[in-house]
Amino acid sequence: MGMSSLKLLKYVLFFFNLLFWICGCCILGFGIYLLIHNNFGVLFHNLPSLTLGNVFVIVGSIIMVVAFLGCMGSIKENKCLLMSFFILLLIILLAEVTLAILLFVYEQKLNEYVAKGLTDSIHRYHSDNSTKAAWDSIQSFLQCCGINGTSDWTSGPPASCPSDRKVEGCYAKARLWFHSNFLYIGIITICVCVIEVLGMSFALTLNCQIDKTSQTIGL
């Protein structure tokens, strides 16, 4: 692989990572906006950090850090940064694959766990403002009521439930959406993994090329 190929590889890696860094900035910014302006509340009391704002902030930050390493490592031809970029991507990829397998294997267990957590949160609706805010946001946005149905609200549905007599449950509706769009979710997940593998391959190739170029120049 010649100098021109090295340059091409270097700039492809740089521009793609720059693009991802900008995306990461947007996600982080949106997360911060949600944390400041929108109180979506806490749905799971045993996971108080699991809020929409926090999820966006964490995901955005990870994308920014990884993309930054990719950008700087490629443009500066820095082996240490490139290897850090490679290792981080590898960790993320392994985590994603592990998570996907666990979700697939323990789907029923997860359903039960989530349903229990949601049932607990329904019982806290009138006593906890954060839980109330979370439920009100979800029910208004998804046009649903309760976990599996309106009867989950044993003392009657709150005002955030649609006024129709027959309304789907929120968790039921979300589960149905995931199962109906399983193919698309799968395709998107595979595409993300492919992009990560490509990023890792490019970083490794560029790393090797930096070595070879250094030897050729006689450094």
């Epitope: 599996n148 149905g149 309106t150 009867s151 009657g156 006024s163 129709d164 007599r165 027959k166 789907e168 449950g169 968790y171 039921a172 509706k173 589960r175 149905l176």
Partner: antibody, heavy 118, light 112 residues
Framework: QVQLQQSGTELMKPGASVKLSCKAT????????IEWVKQRPGHGLEWIGE????????NYNEKFKGKATFTADSSSNTAYMQLSSLTTEDSAIYYC???????????WGTGTTVTVSS | DVVMTQTPLSLSVTIGQPASISCKSS???????????LNWLLQRPGQSPKLLIY???KLESGIPDRFSGSGSGTDFTLKISRVEVEDLGVYYC?????????FGSGTKLEIK
């Protein structure tokens, strides 16, 4: 025309489980909730709960939670109710009926008689 | 749970005479969508229940107009202007405004 056809008589032993079926014809199955109703002599009619076929949405009468479980198969237009840990108190006629935001308990199934006896 | 109190428990009527059944609920059946979800059902001997009246006063298609329903809030009435032989059976009121849905205890109509 619109019909709800239920499975035949079931004679069960105490502690066993039974799965009752309700096959819908003549309408869009996923557009209506399927309601389940219990009738015991001298006890009148009791609402057990409901399921929206093609969805995971269910509503149960608190009294029957843990006793009844609803499922539905959209491909065969059939709703099911499983009754677990049967006792003589579960001996009854079980009806399915349909319900929506526009039609209310307008079509009833033929009924399934469940007898629990040792 | 909403308790549906039906009176009388049994009714013996001569053919051609009127009949009236009352149903009282323990709380208002007015739903927040503005409708009152109260039905009247007839169960003939050995048959499945059959819908007669829905939304308090609306007559189900195919049901003779000698049947009529009225009421609001917590008090409801089913009237038969002229009883006929095929009207014998048990009449139930059903509320489906509040969970769990509940039925009246039933009124047995007999022919004198």
């Amino acid at each position: 025309q619109v019909q709800l056809q239920q499975s035949g008589t079931e004679l069960m032993k105490p502690g066993a489980s039974v799965k009752l079926s309700c096959k819908a014809t003549g309408y869009t199955f996923t557009g209506y909730w399927i309601e389940w109703v219990k009738q015991r002599p001298g006890h009148g009619l009791e609402w057990i709960g409901e399921i929206l076929p093609g969805s995971y949405s269910t509503n149960y009468n608190e009294k029957f939670k843990g006793k009844a479980t609803f499922t539905a198969d959209s491909s065969s237009n059939t709703a099911y109710m499983q009754l677990s840990s049967l006792t003589t108190e579960d001996s009854a006629i079980y009806y399915c009926t349909r319900d929506s935001n526009y039609e209310w308990f307008d079509v009833w199934g033929t009924g399934t008689t469940v007898t629990v006896s040792s | 749970d909403v308790v549906m109190t039906q009176t009388p428990l049994s009714l013996s009527v001569t053919i051609g005479q009127p009949a009236s059944i009352s149903c009282k609920s323990s709380q208002s059946l007015l739903h927040r969508d503005g409708e009152t979800y109260l039905n009247w059902l007839l169960q003939r001997p050995g048959q499945s229940p059959k819908l007669l009246i829905y939304l308090v006063s609306k007559l189900e298609s195919g049901i003779p107009d000698r049947f009529s329903g009225s009421g609001s809030g917590t008090d409801f009435t089913l009237k038969i202007s002229r009883v006929e032989v095929e009207d014998l059976g048990v009449y139930y009121c059903l509320q489906h405004t509040h969970f769990p849905y509940t039925f009246g205890s039933g009124t047995k109509l007999e022919i004198k």
